[in-house]
């Protein structure tokens, strides 16, 4: 029996053929963020919850310490949802008062640490200002993208304000990625 | 021949291959909404085009009376689109007077509903404070994520607010799922 | 040895088996756009970064000349991100005044082109009203679906400003699609 | 380990400018929002306003038109001041360390007596 | 601004015992209600937060419950070191207000 007949002509005869359930994947979920010390220059990074409720890991995907760490090399869609909440800052009255400033902004970064490279790699960014006119607000930033990971990267996501950050339910920030 | 010339030699021999375009898919667009009854404390569900223009079930994805059914147990990719419009309540000219209420908003649930489970599980919520300057305003909330979902699971979109729903176009307000 | 015994027993024994990582991806980014001619009643369509940095084509998924050249005939996942950004206009001081007028609004579209058919075809669409109260403002708009395509269509991203995208970060604005 | 400590001058005369430094380990100031309350005996806790981490400010109404919080996130500081002091304006003057709803963590206090 | 109440000032109990204590809103705060405890020297600690989570190193003695405007703090199992005064907080809009707090003494 031979390969090709289970794949089209153009296939390469040496690409392994893999059972999809055994795919790495993650999906992890929001859970209440306490201060802790980061990087100079790199917004701090979210811890998640991996294994109750709607999260998991499976198929050699682990979270460890604020990160996903990726098991095999391979194309992956990741994305990630935060939904930020807060009360209203002065900038409104600033900016009314002919003083254009810099906006109040939030943030959400998805990176990819990789051991063997001194940098992280930022991979997704939402950001968008902030100047709402009511006293409550509450957003979301959705990011999803495909990328090709090495064994062995690291993926995190990263948040301007983590004390934005909405941790009451789990549907609401959230973050995950799985092998295509 | 042996299974593992197929595989990497982490894949579990009883993992079953299959083709990849005989799996459970489905993408459907926006309907005129009308007005229907809703479990008290459950924002309503929207119905959907399930075959016209874009919109398509296939592999054994049905759509019926506003629910995707859910044929065969694995891991999904989950996503919606809703796109909202109104006016501009009184939120802002309140909050002139100097008087903060609760913001006006608007929400995006994607539920699973389990026939063998009393409650439906909130999978993924967007929700948006909505208090704009402008008359008119319009915006999309973007949700997509992976769950684990079995066999006879039925998956809904509910919105807070049936009547700004953005009908007009199939491609402002969508929903979809597809095993992976 | 027969195929049925690597696949449930649903699956059509004429469907091929193929190998994910032989199956056509893009990710592509952002870069600096220049002013084009585009078609009367479309909105300009971005050109992108398609080898440098995180973006990618591969397994004959081709980018030329703004257009992502589907390969092969199949489901794919299809998204892009435009972040834009932009000073305020007058709209807020129109409406303070009194004459409610169309709003400000940043538009993205993903299109596909089928040469055998006159008119492309929209498929998704985020657009959303600005109005913002601060001086410099930005946002970012996603999209993510699944759709049916056909060897030989085109996928581009139109935005109804393109002096408004923010072209200065691969992970602000980008543009991706795979074969499922 | 977090930490947060305030360090103010004690006494102040009436009419006078109150200025207090809280200064936090364990942390980035750039990250995550400081608030301040204060406990007089007369008005129980009571919050006065808080900086986020991208540096913007929210006050109590009551209070606004006095109050300023500014702070330096190089020196992990934190910089509440207050004109016009009363007398009931004394009170022990916390610092705290949140989420957008909650004080997590709160500094030790530090009395403030306003007095001639 | 939200008015919060605790309408008992001061409260008597012996070790072992289970202790209520109750907070009401002057409007519905959708469950964003905090619960410090205030030790005699002036520390204070965060135990609950949005309504019924309980804080990082806080025992499981303590629990919340609560809805819409009604809320409470409940200690399962009193221990001496429970004994300070113990305040709500509302965290659902500007100005944050507290209650005026539920002193528990010893028995």
């Known amino acids: 029996l031979k390969g090709q007949e289970f794949a089209p002509s153009h296939q390469q005869v040496y690409a392994p053929l893999r059972a999809d359930g055994d795919k790495p994947r993650a999906h992890l979920t929001v859970v209440r963020q306490t201060p802790t010390q980061h990087f100079k220059n790199q917004f701090p990074a979210l811890h998640w919850e991996h294994e109750l409720g709607l999260a998991f890991t499976k198929n050699r995907m682990n979270y460890t310490n604020k990160f996903l760490l990726i098991p095999e090399s391979g194309d992956y869609f990741i994305y990630s949802q935060v939904t930020f909440r807060g009360m209203t800052s002065e900038c409104s009255e600033i900016r009314q008062a002919g003083r254009p400033n810099k906006p109040d902004s939030i943030t959400v970064v998805i990176t990819k640490v990789t051991d063997s490279y001194p940098e992280p790699t930022q991979l997704l960014m939402g950001t968008k200002s902030v100047c709402e006119v009511g006293s409550n607000w509450f957003q979301p930033i959705y990011l999803g993208a495909m990328f090709s990971l090495q064994e062995g990267d690291k993926l995190m996501v990263n948040v301007s304000d983590i004390s934005l950050v909405d941790y009451t339910k789990e549907d609401k920030t959230f973050f995950g990625a799985f092998l295509l | 021949l042996k299974g593992q010339e197929f595989a990497p030699s982490h894949q579990q021999v009883y993992a079953p291959l299959r083709a990849d375009g005989d799996k459970p898919r489905a993408h459907l667009t926006v309907v005129r909404q009308t007005p229907t009854q809703h479990f008290k404390n459950q924002f309503p569900a929207l119905h959907w085009e399930h075959e016209l223009g874009l919109a398509f079930t296939k592999n054994r994805m049905n759509y019926t009376n506003k629910f995707l059914l859910i044929p065969e147990s694995g891991d999904y990719f989950i996503y919606s689109q809703v796109t909202f419009r109104g006016m501009t309540s009184e939120c802002s000219e309140i909050r002139q007077a100097g008087r903060p209420n609760k913001p006006d908003s608007i929400t995006v649930v994607i539920t699973k509903v389990t026939d063998s489970y009393p409650e439906p599980t909130q999978l993924l919520m967007g929700t948006k404070s909505v208090c704009e300057v402008g008359s008119n305003w319009f915006q999309p909330i973007y949700l997509g994520a992976m769950f684990s979902l079995q066999e006879g699971d039925k998956l809904m979109v509910n919105v807070s607010d049936i009547s700004l729903v953005d009908y007009t176009k199939e491609d402002k307000t969508f929903f979809g799922a597809f095993l992976l | 040895l027969k195929g049925q015994e690597f696949a449930p027993s649903h699956q059509q024994v004429y469907a091929p088996l193929r190998a994910d990582g032989d199956k056509p991806r893009a990710h592509l980014t952002v870069v600096r756009q220049t002013p084009t001619q585009h078609f009367k009643n479309q909105f300009p369509a971005l050109h992108w970064e398609h080898e440098l940095g995180l973006a990618f084509t591969k397994n004959r998924m081709n980018y030329t000349n703004k257009f992502l050249l589907i390969p092969e005939s199949g489901d794919y996942f299809i998204y892009s991100q435009v972040t834009f950004r932009g000073m305020t206009s007058e709209c807020s001081e129109i409406r303070q005044a009194g004459r409610p007028n169309k709003p400000d609004s940043i538009t993205v579209v993903i299109t596909k082109v089928t040469d055998s058919y006159p008119e492309p075809t929209q498929l998704l669409m985020g657009t959303k009203s600005v109005c913002e109260v601060g001086s410099n403002w930005f946002q970012p708009i996603y999209l993510g679906a699944m759709f049916s395509l056909q060897e030989g269509d085109k996928l581009m991203v139109n935005v109804s400003d393109i002096s408004l995208v923010d072209y200065t970060k691969e992970d602000k604005t980008f543009f991706g699609a795979f074969l499922l | 380990q977090i930490q947060l400590k305030e360090s103010g001058p004690g006494l102040v005369a009436p009419s006078q400018s109150l200025s207090i430094t809280c200064t936090v380990s364990?942390?980035?100031?750039?990250?995550?929002?400081v608030d301040w309350v204060r406990q007089s005996p007369g008005k129980g806790l009571e919050w006065l306003g808080v900086?986020?981490?991208?540096?913007?400010?929210n006050y109590n109404s009551a209070l606004k038109s006095r109050l300023s919080i500014s702070k330096d996130n190089s020196k992990s500081q934190v910089f509440l001041k207050m004109n016009s002091l009363q007398s009931d304006d004394s009170a022990i003057y916390y610092c705290?360390?949140?989420?957008?709803?909650?004080?997590?963590?709160w500094g030790q206090g530090t009395s403030v007596t306003v007095s001639s | 601004d939200i008015q919060m109440t605790q309408t008992t000032s001061s409260l008597s109990a012996s070790l072992g015992d289970r202790v209520t204590i109750s907070c009401r809103a002057s409007?519905?705060?959708?469950?964003?209600l905090n619960w410090y405890q205030q030790k005699p020297d002036g520390t204070v600690k965060l135990l609950i937060y949005?309504?019924?989570r309980l804080h990082s190193g806080v025992p499981s003695r303590f629990s919340g419950s609560g809805s819409g405007t009604d809320y409470s703090l409940t200690i399962s199992n009193l221990e001496q070191e429970d004994i300070a005064t113990y305040f709500c907080?509302?965290?659902?809009?500007?100005?944050?207000?507290f209650g005026s707090g539920t002193k528990l003494e010893i028995k």
């Open positions: 705290a360390s949140g989420n957008f709803d909650a004080m997590d963590y």
């Open positions: 364990g942390f980035s100031l750039s990250s995550y929002g």
């Open positions: 900086i986020w981490g991208f540096g913007g400010t």
């Open positions: 409007q519905d705060i959708s469950n964003y």
């Open positions: 949005y309504t019924s």
């Open positions: 907080q509302q965290g659902n809009t500007l100005p944050f207000t």
